[in-house]
């Protein structure tokens, strides 16, 4: 019986040049977690695994950071980030519960409305 | 219980268009997941042609991205593949399945076999 | 494209048997790969996701293991029901592969 629930942050949105933190929590439930996936309709982004510790897909080396806690934070953000992303957490004995946010990449406020001088 | 349905036509002919319907009951495409097609051609390995989210947007393998199309009409909760140009290679049988959060595939239909030939 | 080779491409076991099929990503996956059974005429079976987990209704027989580009599905005790061809598929990114596929026959 899965009596869990996943809180998210819901729909966030951030400048572009910046960054994010996606985050997610399970709670009423007293399942273990055992793994949390950060994915993207067409690929996952990271992984943690309690045994194996964080992977962050090549991908995204360069601009995702772990934590904190189980969030990963996404940074140097540019507008093709603008959409869904998935926290995925695999629980025993639940099984797999999934959260959402989206996320809209807007453009700079300079960069909306020109240089000023 | 989600149920997927494949339909269409058994033969076509080379050079012609490969048009599959699957119809989806039990669960509304456009809530959530995405909504996949693959193909096993006789007696060999499964092969991920590609999908439609419930959003909309579609992915597809790189190896048939000229000749596939993936659509919807959510009206009839069903999504298509048409796929162009076809030659014998493209004998399989067609399978349609909802993807999972993670990306396996939990829900499939029974499959319909298309075979090329003149 | 991730390339998933399966080995053995077929075996033979008694019922009762431990049975192991391997598949090997050609990139790290991390624990991106699912198993999948697949019997003539039918569609494939989910048995297993994100390397070592079992999906619902699965039974405790067949079991998961792996990281990286190494991967593992065990038959702890072969029954004559498990007859079939076994598949692998990382769900990394896409596109999504599959293994070339194992069959499993009886002694």
């Known amino acids: 019986m899965m009596t869990g629930t996943i809180e998210t942050t819901g729909n966030i949105s951030a400048e572009k040049g910046g960054s994010i933190i996606l985050q997610c929590h399970l709670s009423s439930t007293t399942a273990q977690v055992t793994q949390v996936n950060w994915e993207q309709q067409d690929q996952l982004l990271a992984i943690c695994n309690a045994d194996l510790g964080w992977h962050i897909s090549p991908s995204f080396k360069d601009r995702v950071a772990p934590g904190p806690g189980l969030g990963l934070t996404l940074q140097s953000l540019t507008v093709n980030d603008t959409g869904e992303y998935f926290c995925i957490y695999h629980t025993y004995p639940d099984g797999t519960y999934t959260g959402r946010i989206f996320l809209e990449v807007l453009e700079s406020s300079v960069a909306e409305h020109g240089a000023r001088f | 219980d989600v149920q997927l349905q494949e339909s269409g036509p058994g033969l076509v002919k080379p050079s012609q268009t490969l048009s599959l319907t699957c119809t989806v009951t039990?669960?509304?495409?456009?809530?959530?997941?995405?909504w996949n097609w693959i193909r096993q051609p006789p007696g060999k390995g499964l092969e991920w042609m590609g999908y439609?989210?419930?959003?909309?947007?579609?992915r597809y393998n790189p190896s048939l991205k000229s000749r596939i199309t993936i659509s919807r009409d959510t009206s009839k909760n069903q999504f298509s593949l048409k796929l162009s140009s076809v030659t014998a290679e493209d004998t399989a049988t067609y399978y349609c399945?909802?993807?999972?959060?993670?990306?396996?595939?939990?829900?499939w239909g029974q499959g319909t076999l298309v075979t090329v030939s003149s | 494209d991730i390339q998933m080779t399966q080995s053995p491409s077929s075996l033979s076991a008694s019922v009762g048997d431990r049975v192991s099929i391997t598949c090997k990503a050609s990139?790290?996956?991390?624990?991106?790969v699912a198993w999948y059974q697949q019997k003539p005429g039918q569609a494939p079976r989910l048995l297993i996701y994100s390397a070592s987990y079992r999906y619902t209704g699965v039974p405790d027989r067949f079991s998961g293991s792996g990281s990286g580009t190494d991967f593992t599905l065990t038959i702890s005790s072969l029954q004559a029901e498990d007859v079939a061809v076994y598949y692998c598929?990382?769900?990394?990114?896409?596109?999504?592969?599959f293994g070339q596929g194992t069959k499993l026959e009886i002694k």
């Open positions: 990139q790290d996956v991390s624990t991106a």
């Open positions: 039990g669960y509304s495409i456009t809530s959530d997941y995405a």
């Open positions: 399945a909802r993807k999972g959060y993670p990306a396996y595939f939990a829900y």
């Open positions: 598929q990382h769900h990394y990114s896409t596109p999504y592969t």
């Open positions: 439609i989210s419930y959003s909309g947007s579609a």
